[in-house]
Interface confidence: low
């Protein structure tokens, strides 16, 4: 049994880091493998992660980490029984994938303005709470070409757009994702999408 693709890990910078790897053949990850992880400095003990299958030869492990800080560095040991298959290290702050925003809501009751709001996925005491920026994706269910991205570079988890910038009388969907420049993170997954029917009063024609 050998590791074909070494583990790569990303952290949500809160409580979970996810490591994925591939073996050289079909593997029952949960029964055959264990991923041990330990903070390099002294405020921890070794922990064991039981991997799950992720495709025939792929494995994924969700490492529980409380209170991640920028200097944390973990050693990773991948074991198959008594055999050490791979040894490496992982610094969560250098491989951050933020959590996806939640509770995306489209408020259509503001005259001719669409207000989109969502929740910051981090608690206020987490470093990323005040460092997230967002991308909002709005698209038409009827017209695949009607697809737009709005970058929200301020901290408030909301976006206002004029309803008239979208077509009237058709349904739209929106979703939002987050990233943090401070840690040069990857983008989060998209939030679940939300749907609304866009309608607004056409302004009177000018004569």
């Amino acid at each position: 049994m050998k590791v074909l693709q070494e583990p790569t890990c990303v952290s949500d910078y809160m409580s979970i880091s996810t490591c994925e790897w591939k073996m050289n053949g079909p593997t029952n990850c949960s029964t055959e493998l264990r991923l041990l992880y330990q903070l390099v400095f002294l405020l921890s003990e070794a922990h064991t992660c039981i991997p799950e299958n992720n495709g025939g030869a792929g494995c994924v492990c969700h490492l529980l980490m409380d209170d991640v800080v920028s200097a944390d560095n973990y050693t990773l040991d991948l074991w198959a029984g008594q055999q050490l298959l791979w040894k490496g290290s992982f610094k969560p702050s250098e491989h951050v994938k933020p959590r996806a925003p939640g509770n995306l809501t489209v408020h259509t009751n503001v005259s001719d303005t669409l207000l989109l709001t969502w929740s910051n996925p981090y608690p206020p005491d987490n470093y990323l709470y005040n460092h997230l920026t967002y991308a909002v994706n709005i698209w038409s269910e009827n017209d695949p070409a009607d697809f737009r991205i709005y970058n929200v570079t301020y901290l408030e988890p909301s976006l206002r757009i004029a309803a008239s910038t979208l077509k009237s009388g058709i349904s739209y969907r929106a979703r939002v994702r987050a990233w943090a420049q401070c840690y040069n993170t990857t983008w989060s997954e998209w939030s679940p999408s939300t749907k609304w029917h866009n309608s607004y009063r056409e302004p009177f024609e000018q004569h």
Partner: antibody, heavy 120, light 107 residues
């Protein structure tokens, strides 16, 4: 100006208990790893205990494990060391220190120390 | 535990002398090493961290070098106020450990 002010030391009989406090000011206490280091009379330095920024992770030297408890109250900017089942070898000056980075590393600020004497 | 062997345990030097103290770790500690100065009746003061980085506000006559197991602390030109005991401290392994100290006196 950064200040760490320890209190709570004193004379205690073997088997007794003491609670040391360290009042911090002049820096963001709630995001700092903190620790206690002690120095027996005429001796060198010994790392005793450490705690991370939110109190979720703690560390104890083998010599005090099970007897000492480190804690913090970020709302009061105060670090604590609850010491029980004290022994003569716990006699020392106890220093409250701040870790230089957000991990257990070099200690850039130290209090003036509080003296603990365990004797009958 | 990682043992930190500091030498010499004491030394006497004249004002203006170059003073060198060494610290040897029983196993690799990378550059996770600090140096402290402690004057009688006072708390230790951080001088050097990460083996060679000078702490803010510390005079440039103090310096550190080394990595792995062998480290050196140098005072380029000894001043009267440098009379103190100096400690090395590794924070790579658990538990963090200190050297036994070097007591520096003026001739």
């Amino acid at each position: 100006e950064v200040q760490l002010v320890e209190s709570g030391g004193g004379l205690v009989q073997p088997g007794g208990s003491l609670r040391l406090s360290c009042a911090a000011s002049g820096f963001t206490f709630s995001s700092s790893y903190m620790s206690w280091v002690r120095q027996a009379p005429g001796k060198g330095l010994e790392y005793v205990s450490a705690i991370n920024s939110n109190g979720g992770k703690t560390y104890y030297a083998d010599s005090v494990k099970g007897r000492f408890t480190i804690s913090r109250d970020n709302s009061k900017n105060t670090l604590y060391l609850q010491m029980s089942s004290l022994r003569a070898e716990d006699t020392a000056v106890y220093y409250c220190t701040r870790q230089r980075g957000n991990y257990v590393g070099a200690m850039d600020y130290w209090g003036q120390g509080t003296s603990v004497t365990v004797s009958s | 535990d990682i043992q930190m062997t500091q030498s010499p345990s004491s030394l006497s030097a004249s004002v203006g002398d170059r003073v060198t103290i060494t610290c040897q770790a029983s196993q690799d500690v990378s550059t996770a090493l600090a140096w402290y100065q402690q004057k009688p009746g006072k708390a230790p003061k951080l001088l050097i961290y990460s083996a060679s980085n000078l702490e803010t506000g510390v005079p440039s006559r103090f310096s550190g070098s080394g990595s792995g197991t062998d480290f050196t602390f140098t005072i380029s030109s000894l001043q009267p106020e440098d009379i103190a005991t100096y400690y090395c401290h590794q924070y790579y392994g658990s538990p963090p450990t200190f050297g036994g100290g070097t007591k520096l006196e003026i001739k």
